[in-house]
Amino acid sequence: IPTEIPTSALVKETLALLSTHRTLLIANETLRIPVPVHKNHQLCTEEIFQGIGTLESQTVQGGTVERLFKNLSLIKKYIDGQKKKCGEEARRVNQFLDYLQEFLGVMNTEWIIES
Amino acid sequence: IPTEIPTSALVKETLALLSTHRTLLIANETLRIPVPVHKNHQLCTEEIFQGIGTLESQTVQGGTVERLFKNLSLIKKYIDGQKKKCGEEARRVNQFLDYLQEFLGVMNTEWIIES
């Protein structure tokens, strides 16, 4: 799979492959994988990909299921790249405060916050 | 500040305090703090709170600016709690795949993905 494929297209294809291979993936009935309790997904990327690793090690490889796990590893690579971009640019306090305001505003409106 | 205050109310109050104390916070013109390049905020919580720590250490404390940083530390505490909930519950593969599908679906529709 060329890494040049746009990430958005990669995600769409991965969703389709996930549906296709569901039966094969759930074959191991004893396997248990951590599942986040909330829906603030971006906070849990590390655990999600650890779970994917566990699942991959327990799944018979071959055919397009390999493509599914290859896609997922490319998505992880993209997310790792995004995480790197969190701390690379040292800016002035002014810009940091604008970003902090945006972050808190998003928390206020979009995060799933329990009372 | 009682930690019993709902997180949503805490975030709102913090946004207001941020506006109030902006002039004081930007007083240090040489200070530089990492600012994420993208808007996938949840991926960057660690760096954001490191930045807040840097800012706090460089800001003259007293009055309601102390309340601002206290609030921000309570918000961090809430987020740390959410992060803990990412990996506490070991579930069957079926549930994990449901969550993975939801995660990819959210990535597909809500994440800020560069082409």
Epitope: K85, A90, R91, N94, E102, V106 | V35, V37
Partner: antibody, heavy 119, light 107 residues
């Protein structure tokens, strides 16, 4: 492809207001800040301010604070720059420009809108 | 506000010449500087960002260098389409400020 298309030229009287639009296409509008820059005839470039369509937050060059108002309409992916109390020195080409990331370089520019202030 | 001083304000050069334009910031702006090209009657176009990073699609004859307060734009071999006005822009702090421009004319 990514594009910013601005409204047409305007002629205004001193004291009036003008509202220039900038329609974005080819990308998710809320992901990038929109900056406004102006250029008086034969002069250099001057930054007016930016707006963050993600949260409607705007920041202005002090020189324009109180006279310039930046707004967005997310439903149409359009940014607006309104300048009030116009004077002859406001005669300029006004450009919108997209920020590549948060507080980054301007990677896409609009074609410009000429605003002429004359009695 | 941060002042950006560009020099020269204009220069005459021939096709094939190596051209250098400098920009000096009134205070440290790290590397948050871009170089912008503008042709008469056209919208500006960003060529370089972060002082030395060439934007996709911009010819490699353009290069940028510098950090802190002193920056340089170099055109290694001037082409006919490069005759234009060039501006530096600091996006380190608000308000963002531009240099006054350097007009590159045909000798």
């Amino acid at each position: 492809q990514v594009q910013l298309v601005q409204s047409g030229a305007e002629v205004k009287k001193p004291g009036a207001s003008v509202k220039v639009s900038c329609k974005a296409s080819g990308y998710t509008f809320t992901n990038h800040h929109i900056n406004w820059v102006r250029q008086a005839p034969g002069q250099g470039l001057e930054w007016i301010g930016y707006i963050n369509p993600y949260n409607d937050y705007s920041r202005y060059n002090q020189k324009f604070k109180g006279r310039a108002t930046l707004t967005v309409d997310k439903s149409t992916s359009t940014a607006y720059m309104e300048l009030s109390s116009l004077r002859s020195e406001d005669t300029a080409v006004y450009y919108c420009a997209r920020d590549y990331g948060n507080f980054w370089y301007f990677d896409v520019w609009g074609q410009g809108t000429l605003v002429t202030v004359s009695s | 506000d941060i002042q950006m001083t560009q020099s020269p304000s204009s220069l005459s050069a021939s096709v094939g010449d190596r051209v250098t334009i400098t920009c000096k910031a009134s205070q440290d702006i790290n590397s948050y500087l871009s170089w912008i090209q503008q042709k008469p009657g056209k919208a500006p176009k960003t060529l370089i960002h972060r002082a030395d990073r060439l934007i996709d699609g911009v010819p490699s004859r353009f290069s940028g260098s510098g950090s802190g307060q002193d920056f340089t734009l170099t055109i290694s071999s001037l082409q006919p389409e490069d005759f234009a006005t060039y501006y530096c822009l600091q996006y380190d702090d608000f308000p963002y400020t531009f240099g006054q421009g350097t007009k590159v004319e045909i000798k």
